[in-house]
Interface confidence: low
């Protein structure tokens, strides 16, 4: 026979000759950091025919590393399942929990021995200092000195010293969330009043009012032969500014036809609609009233006006 | 290697309703929020909302509010989208995307959603 | 909302070439913890999208040291040293101060 087979956990003890005679065995032995167990054969013969009789390192398997218990509150995965040496050891802490330490060991062979990269890690309880104070308002557990992961508080305004109303400007509720950080900033509390909204040939058709706060929201539509320019529907933001800002009405220009269309209703609320002026034939107007999708309203190719060109 | 596969292309009708989901593995899937994300053709990112599967807790983009509603399964790891009363405005690809904090560091493949009559 | 703006819609770059693209708040995005909530994402062409910067200037994993992030509260950069053709692609920014979370509209990175 040629020389012996060779294998990736095992090795021949002794040094390989050019050929054996039939009959004569080799033996072999598990490699550094591997170790055999029985009851497979770790030999083989030559034989008759100049072959080697099956053999395999199915017998030798790779040193493991310790058994790792998983951290309190967290667990210990070991990569692809197993302990072996030149694996990985990946630590994972439960939510509301973070890792003090290695997130990864690795098992490693020190002489013959398999032994971990280092210590395990533990996993500690996510705590957040008290949330931001605001100025004209408050959160609530203000006395609590320490919060848990996902312990939420919730901020409200004082009541204003005159005749507005503070408004809380933001999401009232965060909560602790992960690495110690609260989940967004606080919100603020202050006063915010938006002027009284005047469309000149128009008219208010929802959110009627005094006085329009935070979040007030007021719609609009224009009186017959006028068109908005601007949006139907604005909303007093955190600048006690209207955004969008307040529509203008404008007038319809009529069509230079001698027939002029009998307007059956106003042209309004950010309408899709054309004006008569641009579905007309004729001298055109600078201006196009503005296309949106209002829902309600016609898409453009489907004009209420266009029947009457 | 963390993955989010998310189901198959839709092709629904005006009005009716279809639920997406995006399958988590090889993390724990309650340790983060899953986010979900539309992109129409040619267009940006817009983000509609999170949801927290250990809590249920999910957030929405007031855009979207009354037109999707997620969920989340944790026994099969799997977050789910629903959109109702589709128009051809939804038509989209829809992305899952794993983070907590706005670190979306894993992302589904995409959906695409075509409304059509 | 928070209004996030990329000016520029595309940068058209020669390979090996350092770029910077930029991103405004409409907000500031730094909490009082210290942290900035930005994070930048890149989508490559037909690809989903891909985060490689969070809190504004740490590199996420896997990505390259090409890339970084740097900024004040509302003005923010992405910069990418020796540009490479894997590189092309839509840069969106992302902030995450509050809800909703809103992105730029993109910067699409073109290779001369």
């Known amino acids: 026979c040629e020389e012996p087979p060779t294998f990736e956990a095992m090795e021949l003890i002794g040094k390989p000759k050019p050929y054996y005679e039939i009959g004569e065995r080799v033996d072999y032995k598990c490699k550094k950091g591997y170790f055999y167990i029985p009851p497979l054969a770790t030999h083989t013969i030559c034989d008759r025919n100049h072959t080697w009789l099956p053999v395999s390192d199915d017998a030798c398997y790779r040193e493991t590393c310790p058994y790792i218990r998983d951290p309190l509150n967290g667990q210990a995965v070991p990569a692809n399942g197993t302990y072996e040496f030149g694996y990985q050891m990946h630590f994972i802490c439960n939510e509301g929990y973070y890792l003090i330490g290695e997130e990864i060991l690795y098992c490693e062979l020190k002489g013959s021995v398999a032994i971990w990269s280092g210590k395990p890690p533990i996993c500690e309880k996510v705590l957040c200092t008290p949330p931001p104070k605001i100025k004209n308002g408050k959160h609530t557990f203000s006395e609590v000195e320490v919060f848990e992961y996902l312990d939420a508080v919730t901020y409200s305004c004082d009541p204003a010293p005159g005749p507005d109303p503070f408004s809380l400007i933001g999401e009232s509720t965060i909560y602790c969330g992960d690495n110690s950080v609260w989940s967004r900033a606080a919100p603020e509390c202050k006063v915010v009043k938006c002027r009284f909204p005047v469309v000149e040939n128009g008219k208010q058709i929802s959110g009627f009012g005094k006085k329009f706060y935070y979040k007030a929201t007021v719609m609009f539509e224009c009186d017959k032969g006028f068109y908005l320019d601007g949006s139907d529907t604005i909303v007093c933001d955190s600048n006690s500014t209207w955004d969008p800002p307040v529509p203008k009405c404008l007038k319809v220009l009529p069509p230079s036809s001698t027939k002029p269309p009998a307007l059956s209703h106003s042209v309004s609320t950010s309408s899709t609609t054309k004006s008569p002026a641009s579905s007309a034939s004729g001298p055109r107007p600078t201006y196009k009233p503005p296309v949106s999708n209002y829902p309600g309203y016609p898409k453009p190719e489907e004009g209420i006006l266009d029947s009457l060109d | 290697q963390v993955q989010l596969q998310q189901s198959g292309a839709e092709l629904a009708r005006p009005g009716a309703s279809v639920k997406l989901s995006c399958k988590a593995s090889?993390?724990?899937?309650?340790?983060?929020?899953i986010s979900w994300v539309k992109q129409r053709t040619g267009q940006g990112l817009e983000w509609i909302g999170e949801i927290f599967p250990r809590s249920g807790n999910t957030y929405y983009n007031e855009k979207f509010k009354g037109k999707a509603t997620l969920t989340a399964d944790k026994s099969s790891s799997t977050a789910y989208m629903e959109l109702r009363s589709l128009t051809s405005e939804d038509s989209a690809v829809y992305f899952c995307a794993r983070g907590l904090g706005g670190a979306m560091d894993y992302w589904g493949q995409g959906t695409s959603v075509i409304v059509s009559s | 909302d928070i209004v996030m703006t990329q000016a520029a819609p595309s940068v058209p770059v020669t390979p090996g070439e350092s770029v910077s693209i930029s991103c405004r708040s409409s907000k500031s995005l730094l909490h009082s913890n210290g942290n900035t909530y930005l994070y930048w994402f890149l989508q490559r062409p037909g690809q989903s999208p891909q985060l490689l910067i969070y809190?504004?200037?740490n590199l996420a994993s896997g990505v390259p040291d090409r890339f970084s992030g740097s900024g004040s509260g509302t003005t923010f950069t992405l910069r990418i040293s020796g540009v490479e053709a894997e590189d092309v692609g839509v840069y969106y920014c992302m902030q995450h101060l509050e809800y909703p979370c809103t992105f730029g509209g993109g910067t699409k990175l073109e290779i001369k």
């Open positions: 090889d993390y724990t899937f309650t340790s983060y929020g």
């Open positions: 809190r504004m200037s």
